[in-house]
């Protein structure tokens, strides 16, 4: 008789990323007997929840159950029923909920309570919903990309998994951009740190890693835009804000109450003689860049070197994977290629921002106008953040790799979070098992 492969013993895990602008559900799978190996867990599904981030449900938490239904039902379909009860479900909320918690602990707790109650109604092994720290978000993003790139593996490979993978075991730094915060995480050359708050020590697969990480709350792309508008409206002579970060001909009315709703704009808050103002785009990259730079306080640094706002940043070291909104924005702008220099990126941004709004709308007819209108700002912000905020240079720009997926799994904190909570990253190098996961009889 023909040799037949025994069915693999497959395990699944679910992580919900409750971000500031939306929630995504990720389903991961791995062969059970290989769960301590590196690189065996991969993403099988991403389900984007329809609607805004959970922090926007503060006054309608009774709708959270319905909000989560479609993606949780999708998970029910994708994961075999026999596996449901042993499939862990984790929900991690990031900066949107951190900001809500700053405003009201009671409201943030209520949202999480209702999320927990909703998720507990499914047949999975629900493990809780919590607001993860910025440090965790940075660290888990770093673990994810290095796990997927095979950097923790002690076996040297004769082949390359992804184009920018080198066979050395030097880890990649992680650059993560969300709507409300941004994280930078990497292993610096110098093992001693001037700022213990930014230092993490890991022992993974028998190797020690001294990692630098920082999360800048309010410096995600959406909150950075609110900050910029709040800063610029202070000096506007009337209720018209001529804004270089929007395309020429673009117009939008903004409520002052919306502008000052977020804790991120508190430092710019003032009594204005109007309740609304109109953004009028003038599309000038250079002026937009200058306006964005004013969000970064670089005049004060109590360390040998800082990023901005007095936050320690050691000298950059090695390659970096830039993911989440870093990737989404640069991918939209067609600027993710390894061959595009920083000078070329700047040139293309200048060209893009100066294009008239009507022309842009025609060229990208399928894109929602709300998102489309903000790419000039977002692209400019990314350049400013990387160059002036984190001190990348024209030379070191080539060490930034804009990454969406690695081996079919999204780059982001969720995989690292699950690997940690399921104890799938051992401190020591596991002994290799004699059998592969497909055994033939």
């Amino acid at each position: 008789t023909q040799n037949k492969a025994l069915p693999e013993n497959i395990k699944y895990g679910i992580v919900l990323d409750a971000g500031s602008s939306h929630t995504s559900l990720y389903i991961y799978k791995w062969p059970a007997e290989k769960e301590n190996d590196t690189g065996v867990v991969h993403q099988v599904e991403e389900c984007r929840v329809k609607g805004p981030g959970i922090s926007k449900y503060v006054q309608k938490v009774n709708e959270i159950g319905i909000y989560l239904t479609d993606c949780m039902e999708r998970a029910r379909e994708v994961i075999p029923r026999s596996q449901h009860q042993e499939t862990p479900v984790y929900l991690g909320a990031t900066a949107g909920m951190r900001l809500l918690r700053m405003e009201s602990e009671e409201l943030a707790d209520r949202v999480l309570d209702v999320v927990e109650r909703s998720l507990s109604n499914y047949p999975f092994d629900f493990q809780g919903a919590r607001i993860i720290t910025g440090q965790e978000e940075g660290a888990y993003g770093w673990i994810t990309i290095n796990y997927l790139l095979g950097k923790f593996s002690q076996k040297t490979r004769w082949f390359s998994i992804v184009p920018y993978e080198t066979n050395n075991q030097e880890t990649f730094g992680a650059l993560d951009l969300g709507g409300a915060s941004t994280q930078i995480t990497f292993v610096p050359q110098n093992q001693t740190t001037e700022s213990p708050d930014n230092a993490l020590q890991f022992r993974l697969y028998g190797k020690d890693y001294n990692v630098y990480t920082h999360s800048f709350l309010c410096y995600g792309k959406d909150q950075a835009l609110w900050q910029k508008l709040a800063k610029d409206i202070q000096v506007a002579s009337n209720e018209i804000l001529r804004d270089p970060c929007f395309h020429p001909g673009y117009k939008k009315v903004v409520n002052v109450s919306d502008l000052y709703k977020t804790p991120c704009t508190k430092r710019f808050e003032m009594t204005l003689p109007f309740q609304q103002f109109e953004i009028q785009g003038i599309g000038n990259y250079q002026q937009c860049h200058q306006s964005v730079l004013e969000l970064f306080n670089t005049s004060y640094c109590p360390y040998s070197q800082c990023a901005f706002n007095g936050i320690f940043l050691p000298p950059l070291q090695g390659d970096f994977g830039a993911f989440s909104a870093f990737y989404f924005v640069m991918n939209f702008l067609n600027l993710t290629s390894e061959k595009v220099s920083q000078e070329k990126v700047t040139e293309m941004m200048k060209k893009f921002c100066s294009q008239p709004w009507e022309e842009i709308k025609t060229s990208y007819a399928g894109v929602k106008e709300k998102y489309l209108s903000e790419y000039c700002f977002s692209g400019t912000y990314i350049l400013s953040l990387l160059l002036q905020g984190y001190h990348f240079t024209a030379d070191s720009w080539e060490h930034i790799h804009f990454i969406g997926k690695i081996q079919g799994s999204d780059a982001g904190w969720t995989l690292g979070y699950m690997l940690n909570l399921t104890n799938m990253i051992p401190a020591e190098q596991p002994l290799s098992t004699p059998l592969s996961h497909s055994t033939y009889v």
Partner: antibody, heavy 121, light 107 residues
């Protein structure tokens, strides 16, 4: 203590516009939504909809879509109801009522004193 | 829309009596029902939420019961200050709706 104080009575002609205010005090304005309820003379209560004071999102009952507009002035902890192109059938007392979370759902726990609007030519 | 029917427009009672005001929903609304008291020339005052939970400060003589489609507000040991109109209200589905009201008269 928690209070919702509404603006005074209004006498208007058909076709005109009226804007009623509801000033909240004693709690954090943006932590609770605001409902609007109509009570025509000698009639029952009719829910008009609510405004999310945190996001600005508007929810209108079908009968109140079109000429009716809810708005906010967050800095003044005030919600507004504007009725455009007034008709005789808009003659009523309008109440604002706080939307609060009790036992897994939202109720109207505190009410304004009401604003009487009379539409007459 | 869910129709909330308060079949008795008026109810007459005496001080010290026990009276029950009823309300019927056209569809199942679970326990998402509230009761309000409105005195002449005043705004409604919240008495009961979630069908049977009293707001703080509401006297113990007011009790709510029911679930699904049938709900009752009971006032035991009626006082003269209870002279008012009582409205039931469902907040289970949009649009939220109110009953037509029951006026309580004191003999």
């Amino acid at each position: 203590q928690i209070q919702l104080v509404q603006s005074g009575p209004e006498l208007k002609k058909p076709g005109e516009t009226v804007k009623i205010s509801c000033k909240a005090s004693g709690y954090t304005f943006t932590h609770y939504g605001m409902n609007w309820v109509k009570q025509a003379p000698g009639k029952g209560l009719k829910w008009m909809g609510w405004i999310n004071t945190y996001t600005g999102e508007l929810t209108y009952a079908d009968d109140f879509k079109g000429r009716f507009a809810f708005s906010l002035e967050t800095s003044a902890s005030t919600a507004y109801l504007q009725i455009n192109n007034l008709k005789n059938e808009d003659t009523a007392t309008y109440f604002c009522a706080r939307r609060a979370y009790y036992r897994y759902d939202y109720v109207m726990d505190y009410w304004g004193q009401g604003t009487s609007v009379t539409v007459s030519s | 829309d869910i129709v909330m029917t308060q079949s008795q427009k008026f109810m007459s009672t005496s001080v010290g009596d026990r009276v029950s005001v009823t309300c019927k929903a056209s569809h199942n609304v679970g326990t998402n029902v509230a009761w309000y008291q409105q005195k002449p020339g005043q705004s409604p005052k919240a008495l009961i939420y979630s069908a049977s939970y009293r707001y703080s400060g509401v006297p113990g003589r007011f009790t709510g019961s029911g679930s699904g489609t049938d709900f009752t507000l009971t006032i035991s040991n009626v006082q003269s200050e209870d002279l008012a109109e009582y409205f039931c209200h469902q907040y289970n589905n949009y649009p939220y709706t109110f009953g037509g009201g029951t006026k309580l008269e004191i003999k």
